[in-house]
Amino acid sequence: SGVFQLQLQEFINERGVLASGRPCEPGCRTFFRVCLKHFQAVVSPGPCTFGTVSTPVLGTNSFAVRDDSSGGGRNPLQLPFNFTWPGTFSLIIEAWHAPGDDLRPEALPPDALISKIAIQGSLAVGQNWLLDEQTSTLTRLRYSYRVICSDNYYGDNCSRLCKKRNDHFGHYVCQPDGNLSCLPGWTGEYCQQPICLSGCHEQNGYCSKPAECLCRPGWQGRLCNECIPHNGCRHGTCSTPWQCTCDEGWGGLFCDQDLNYCTHHSPCKNGATCSNSGQRSYTCTCRPGYTGVDCELELSECDSNPCRNGGSCKDQEDGYHCLCPPGYYGLHCEHSTLSCADSPCFNGGSCRERNQGANYACECPPNFTGSNCEKKVDRCTSNPCANGGQCLNRGPSRMCRCRPGFTGTYCELHVSDCARNPCAHGGTCHDLENGLMCTCPAGFSGRRCEVRTSIDACASSPCFNRATCYTDLSTDTFVCNCPYGFVGSRCEFPVGLPPSFPW
């Protein structure tokens, strides 16, 4: 679809005569008839296949024709066509004399024709005007013409329809050849596809308008490249949605069980070495001079009674010092200057000579100790009670008073709160320092796993065609992430095939 435009510029009829040679009275009031038709080697009679147009009276005898396009007037003359421009044409322009106001052919005098021109040729679509001048014996006509495409038509022959748009069906303008030129942020054959935010993950993200990145279920982040872990996951991460892969030192379904109490809480004091011994359980190995569950108590070095043979111990800044009784010497008064002849063994101890009488050894009766049997046995000296238990002397024996949560002769055993199987629905019981904790299976919660919560919706393998199943524990539902070529809530339909239902 396009328009053949004809711009009449000047008509010269100096003598004011008709084609018959007869003069016009009083002058030739001139109007034009134009016929545009398909190319003919010889311009022939017949329909004006590309259209006709007539002008009003434009002037008398000789005159210039005013360009009246701005006022919506009749110059240039418009000959619209609604087919592919063939590139060739025949053009007939007739100048007629109209004595009165009626320009119909039957109303004109028999010899009203002033002049007639007929041209044929080729003409490409374009903005440039072709200037032409036709001269006969008595008249001259100067004019120009061109072919331009109608609005929304493009190409060499105005055959390509292209209407710019910015809506659901496309976002584009039209190039001079009629091809689409997408608006910024759009792509695709018809510019219907938004260009998502740069870096937006191809599979996990999408967009409905340019520079957007909307995440598919199970994904988050500005570029939808971060998976969403299991709801309630505390100290864990994921590589695919709804996972909860525990960080080092954490365990349990939600990675909220502390398996590395030593690192996370540093309970051991005074440079003691900490060893993990179970969930929220640890043991501190104290440096010399310290005691207590957490090695928080400073020991006097004399508390271990290092001085032998009745020597007395004195604490010093850098250790201790033994003051030996007469007849003894050495760091711990361990060397004797006495022999059995000196009756050195107290409390009924019997003396045995050694090294040919140069030394001796005392064999002590029960309840006495020391190199000279001079000490009553204190069974708590070796600190035999574990886990902070208090040692008590009871005559010939000793006993440990245990801290809550511990039992056994030496408080070496945890009191097992788990012994009575307090965790319901197959929950796993863990002893804690002050109580217990239940790790519940999927679908149960509460301190004793007594509350039914959600189930693993993926357990039944609802997704087809090797789709990946993600459980959303917050809603007890599953989401199937389809591989390429499959669609449907369970990825059950191949793309392009309508579902067939059994009913």
């Epitope: 038709k37 398909h38 017949g46 028999p110």
Partner: antibody, heavy 119, light 111 residues
Framework: QVQLVQSGAEVKKPGASVKISCKAS????????IHWVKQAPGQGLEWIGY????????NYNQKFKGRVTFTTDTSTSTAYMELRSLRSDDTAVYYC????????????WGQGTLVTVSS | DIVMTQSPDSLAVSLGERATISCRAS??????????MKWFQQKPGQPPKLLIY???NQGSGVPDRFSGSGSGTDFTLTISSLQAEDVAVYYC?????????FGGGTKVEIK
Amino acid sequence: QVQLVQSGAEVKKPGASVKISCKASGYSFTAYYIHWVKQAPGQGLEWIGYISSYNGATNYNQKFKGRVTFTTDTSTSTAYMELRSLRSDDTAVYYCARDYDYDVGMDYWGQGTLVTVSS
Amino acid sequence: DIVMTQSPDSLAVSLGERATISCRASESVDNYGISFMKWFQQKPGQPPKLLIYAASNQGSGVPDRFSGSGSGTDFTLTISSLQAEDVAVYYCQQSKEVPWTFGGGTKVEIK
């Protein structure tokens, strides 16, 4: 009143020539074309060709080309057809008719001229 | 050349009845949406008279009972109510290509 008046009947010997006239009135002669049409006795119509009264451009039916010539005289608004090397099968009524670029068709016809070719 | 074939060769119709004449071209006579087809009426001893041009347009002074239709290769002239003065030979003619050609004619008579 548009009129096309043709010259009278002609009797010619084989091999001779004949020139028929068609005088136009009542319209602008130079704006139109003049067609020539043959009708043999008891037969249908046969198109011979046309001439543009404006510039003298012609278009002939190949069947008659070489034996026929169209001319016009704009000063007298008259068209002519000359047919040479006459044969007996040229015996026919010859019509002139006017036509225009804006396709009404051959809307006015002359009354016809009978040409008889006989030895 | 484009050959124009008319049918029937002759047609006898009662007064006031419909008469239909067909014309088939050996190739399409349409160009740029226009049919280069005309119909003429010729009464005995008279020149032909233009009835229809461009397949369906009535010539000047032609009665409304004459109508034309068709496109491409098949065309029809219809006389909706035959009158005594309609007795004549009717010709179709194409002007798409030189040489312009006429159909063989259809003779319409009163039954």
